[in-house]
């Protein structure tokens, strides 16, 4: 069974998948469609790296540009380094500028919805 066939079989169970499962799935060459990706738990999507999302979505990663205003895409973009976003070739803006440090202050983030940044 190839990655696409595997994805079709598990698609209906993905809504509540934790980050660890999504990371594992990104190694399976599943090419998850964007509609399914956007139904995933926001808290499970946010920790994924650009490389992991690229592997998870495959060719459908191109659609992040079209859906950049919607959650969880918007919130995920805000957590990524701009340098990393640039590798997607989509002109996505809003990532963390080069040279900034991301502080994982869970309380601060829970209140503001965005990570706390320290400038260079």
């Amino acid at each position: 069974m190839n990655g696409s066939e595997y994805f079709v079989k598990i698609q209906s169970f993905l809504g509540g998948a934790p980050t660890e499962d999504l990371k594992a799935l990104s190694q399976q060459n599943v090419s998850m469609d964007l509609a399914t990706f956007m139904k995933l738990r926001t808290d499970a999507v946010l920790p994924l790296t650009v490389a992991e999302v690229q592997k998870l979505l495959g060719p459908h990663v191109e659609g992040l540009k079209a859906e950049e205003r919607h959650r969880p895409v918007r919130d995920w973009i805000l957590r990524q380094r701009q340098d990393d976003l640039d590798t997607l070739g989509l002109g996505l803006q809003g990532g963390i500028p080069n040279g900034y440090l991301v502080l994982d202050l869970s309380m601060q983030e829970a209140l503001s919805g965005t990570p706390c940044l320290l400038g260079p």
Epitope: A35, P59, G63, L88, L90
Partner: antibody, heavy 117, light 113 residues
């Protein structure tokens, strides 16, 4: 103004390969994916695949998986599509098309590839 | 693969009259989170490259005359030309961009009656 300029018509023999180029201008080349679509004479449109010009990652329609290669040259803002093991059914106009998000916002003029013995 | 079925194959309409083209997909093209339908419409005039008219099923591309409109959701979509002009003679294609391989309908040829 966005412009996609494609290479000229080609005549190839069965079993040969063809490489079609698509030179882009009028926009930031690495910010938009490039797609390739073909159209056989008098027929409809068939999506062949797409490529991320920033990373060079490409994705192909499984129908062409073993025969197609898409590449980019960022220094010249040019995308390439190479199709190997040509057969008569590959006779078609091959279009490059710049993505607008997912949809195909700008199309090249097309390159006619004729496969004939 | 998602199958796109267009109807009719051809259509003859008088100048100034309405032309309606249908497109049906074999599975939903709706993103239920964003409420966007991943469907586009293209126009291809004789001897020319296709041109984008509509994306997200109903969003008109900039520069496209407002006589062109798209509607529908899920699996059933329609392209309407409210008042056909001579320059609208072309083949019209729908395309899904929900899941690869992105597939096109077979096309609808619009002519003047």
């Amino acid at each position: 103004e966005v412009q996609l300029v494609q290479s000229g018509a080609e005549v190839k023999k069965p079993g040969a390969s063809v490489k079609v180029s698509c030179k882009a201008s009028g926009y930031t080349f690495t910010n938009y994916w490039m797609h390739w679509v073909r159209q056989a004479p008098g027929q409809g449109l068939e999506w062949m695949g797409n490529i991320n010009p920033s990373s060079g990652d490409s994705y192909y329609n499984e129908r062409f998986m073993s025969r197609v290669t898409m590449t980019v040259d960022k220094s010249t803002s040019t995308a390439y599509m190479e199709l190997s093991s040509l057969r008569s059914e590959d006779t078609a106009v091959y279009y490059c098309a710049r993505s607008g998000g997912l949809w195909l916002a700008f199309w090249g003029p097309g390159t006619l590839v004729t496969v004939s013995s | 693969d998602i199958v796109m079925t267009q109807s009719p194959d051809s259509l003859a309409v008088s100048l100034g009259e309405r032309a309606t083209i249908n497109c049906k997909s074999s599975q939903t093209l709706l993103n239920s989170v964003s409420q966007n339908n991943y469907l586009a419409w293209y126009q291809q005039k004789p001897g020319q490259s296709p041109k984008l008219l509509i994306y997200f099923a109903s969003t008109r591309e900039s520069g496209v005359p407002d006589r062109f409109s798209g509607s529908g959701s899920g699996t059933d979509f329609t392209l309407t030309i409210s008042s056909l002009q001579a320059e609208d003679v072309a083949v019209y294609y729908c395309q899904q961009h929900y899941r690869t391989p992105y597939t096109f309908g077979g096309g609808t040829k619009v002519e003047i009656k």
